[in-house]
């Protein structure tokens, strides 16, 4: 039950995280005009990964896409790449994890297969989250560098008579969305990996064979120490419908064609 809950929660957390990464990538407010010195402005600038926008105090907003690929800063291209890789990995991870969910039955898929898929999706979520966090952090670093550079030469002009106010940019909402979303995807991935450990049948998946001795009804299960001492993934004698590994009581109660009497 705990495994299913962990896996389900991991899936949901990752789903929210990836939705957040997609939202952050599409958002226009990666960097916003710094309003520290002038909280009320007639022209407000903000920029995203794909376009820059200007909101006038009149209420009109004008957005212009970056219609060049080669003319864009390498860092911006890198951030775009990281976010897209994060989204793609996350999307594939979600697809894989849907089939890996313990609560979803697909044919006669074995637990080992589900465990492998859970681990795969978990790793994908972790990498996806790291990509998003890295992308957002690279952009944030770029902003900080540019902020202090523009602060250093805030006003430029001839003899101080004519002033050109350089627009400074600070962190936009998308950065915080990206950081949180990346973190959630990462946490979801870790939860999936933890769930994988609980899903994986830890003993070798041989058919259980019961030997009916004359006096006692004892089932011998190959698998060594873990099987005999009650450790491993199936200590609660749960029914596992996978056609192979069975619990001791199940083998005893329901003799099948695999039993040798």
């Amino acid at each position: 039950m705990a495994v299913t809950a962990c896996q389900g929660l991991g899936f949901v957390v990752s789903l929210i995280g990836i939705a957040g990464i997609i939202a952050a990538t599409c958002m226009d407010q990666w960097s916003t005009q710094d309003l520290y010195n002038n909280p009320v402005t007639a022209v407000f600038n903000y920029q995203g990964l794909w376009r820059s926008c200007v909101r006038e105090s009149s209420g009109f907003t004008e957005c212009r896409g970056y219609f060049t690929l080669l003319g864009l800063p390498a860092m911006l291209q890198a951030v775009r790449a990281l976010m897209i890789v994060g989204i793609v990995l996350g999307a594939i991870g979600l697809l894989v994890s849907i089939f890996a969910l313990k609560c979803i039955r697909i044919g006669s898929m074995e637990d080992s297969a589900k465990a492998n898929m859970t681990l795969t999706s978990g790793i994908m979520f972790i990498v996806s989250g790291l990509c998003a966090i890295a992308g957002v952090s690279v952009f944030a670093n770029m902003l900080v560098t540019n902020f202090w550079m523009s602060t250093a030469n805030m006003y430029t002009g001839m003899g101080g008579m004519v002033q050109t106010v350089q627009t400074r940019y600070t962190f936009g909402a998308a950065l915080f969305v990206g950081w949180v979303a990346g973190g959630l995807t990462l946490i979801g991935g870790v939860m999936m990996c933890i769930a994988c450990r609980g899903l994986a049948p830890e003993e070798t998946n041989y058919k259980a064979v019961s030997y009916h001795a004359s006096g006692h009804s004892v089932a011998y299960k190959p698998g060594g120490f873990k099987a005999s001492t009650g450790f491993g993934s199936n200590t609660k004698n749960k029914k596992i419908y996978d056609g192979g590994a069975r619990t001791e009581d199940e083998v005893q109660s329901y003799p099948s064609k695999h039993d040798y009497v």
């Epitope: 022209v43 600038n45 920029q47 006038e56 009149s58 209420g59 004519v162 002033q163 050109t164």
Partner: antibody
Framework: EIQLQQSGAELVKPGASVKISCKAS????????MNWVRQSHGKSLEWIGN????????TYNHKFKGKATLTVDKSSSTAYMQLISLTSEDSAVYYC???????????WGQGTLVTVSA | DIVMTQSPSSLTVTAGEKVTMSCKSS????????????LTWYQQKPGQPPKLLLY???TRESGVPDRFTGSGSGTDFTLTISSVQAEDLAVYYC?????????FGSGTKLEIK
């Protein structure tokens, strides 16, 4: 057709206050800020401030803070400007104007003449 | 506050002539975000409210004759009337629309001979 209809001329005594109205029609009143501009006789134009009718939040020219108070009544699509502690310096034509692209003022009221005289 | 300086304060021309008037701002009105200059030109005829001619320094408002053209960037702007008509007799104002408080120039009075 967008129209801004201002209240009639006012003759007031020094130290008194006056409230000018500007009724908007032909557009959704809450969509655009309303600006107020002053023009003293034979002089240039001075921007007093503007108000966002949706939130009722004003922005003032620091020169007119404490002199002008901007308000709106959404139900009647009317903007108001109250001027207090009037002096002869405040005698002018007061215009309301709404916003357009580029923060320009494409539509203007006909103006309200305020005369401050003892 | 941004100071807007217009010149000349008045000019007298004959109908059909080309006329130019200047407007200078104490700070750049060019917004880096969209590369637009937040300068507006108005025409005010006697006894009337101002009428919007051009915004973003050079974009003509609808209904404005194409003889009115605006140019310039940053701090220096020009309004040109290619062929002055009798109905162009008015005072022309430039306005800073870039930062609060919005400020107007002192105006250029256009008179027809």
């Amino acid at each position: 057709e967008i129209q801004l209809q201002q209240s009639g001329a006012e003759l007031v005594k020094p130290g008194a206050s006056v409230k000018i109205s500007c009724k908007a029609s032909g557009y959704s009143f809450t969509d655009y800020h309303m600006n107020w501009v002053r023009q003293s006789h034979g002089k240039s134009l001075e921007w007093i401030g503007n108000i966002d009718p949706y939130y009722g939040s004003p922005t003032y020219n620091h020169k007119f803070k404490g002199k002008a108070t901007l308000t709106v009544d959404k139900s009647s699509s009317t903007a108001y400007m109250q001027l207090i502690s009037l002096t002869s310096e405040d005698s002018a034509v007061y215009y309301c104007a709404n916003y357009g692209r580029g923060n320009s003022f494409p539509y203007w009221g006909q103006g309200t003449l305020v005369t401050v005289s003892a | 506050d941004i100071v807007m300086t217009q010149s000349p304060s008045s000019l007298t021309v004959t109908a059909g002539e080309k006329v130019t008037m200047s407007c200078k701002s104490s700070q750049s009105l060019l917004n880096s975000g969209n590369q637009r200059n937040y300068l507006t030109w108005y025409q005010q005829k006697p006894g009337q409210p101002p009428k919007l001619l051009l915004y973003w320094a050079s974009t003509r408002e609808s209904g404005v004759p194409d003889r009115f053209t605006g140019s310039g960037s940053g701090t220096d702007f020009t309004l040109t009337i290619s062929s002055v008509q009798a109905e162009d007799l008015a005072v022309y104002y430039c306005q800073n629309d870039y930062s609060f408080p919005f400020t107007f120039g002192s105006g250029t009075k256009l008179e027809i001979k």
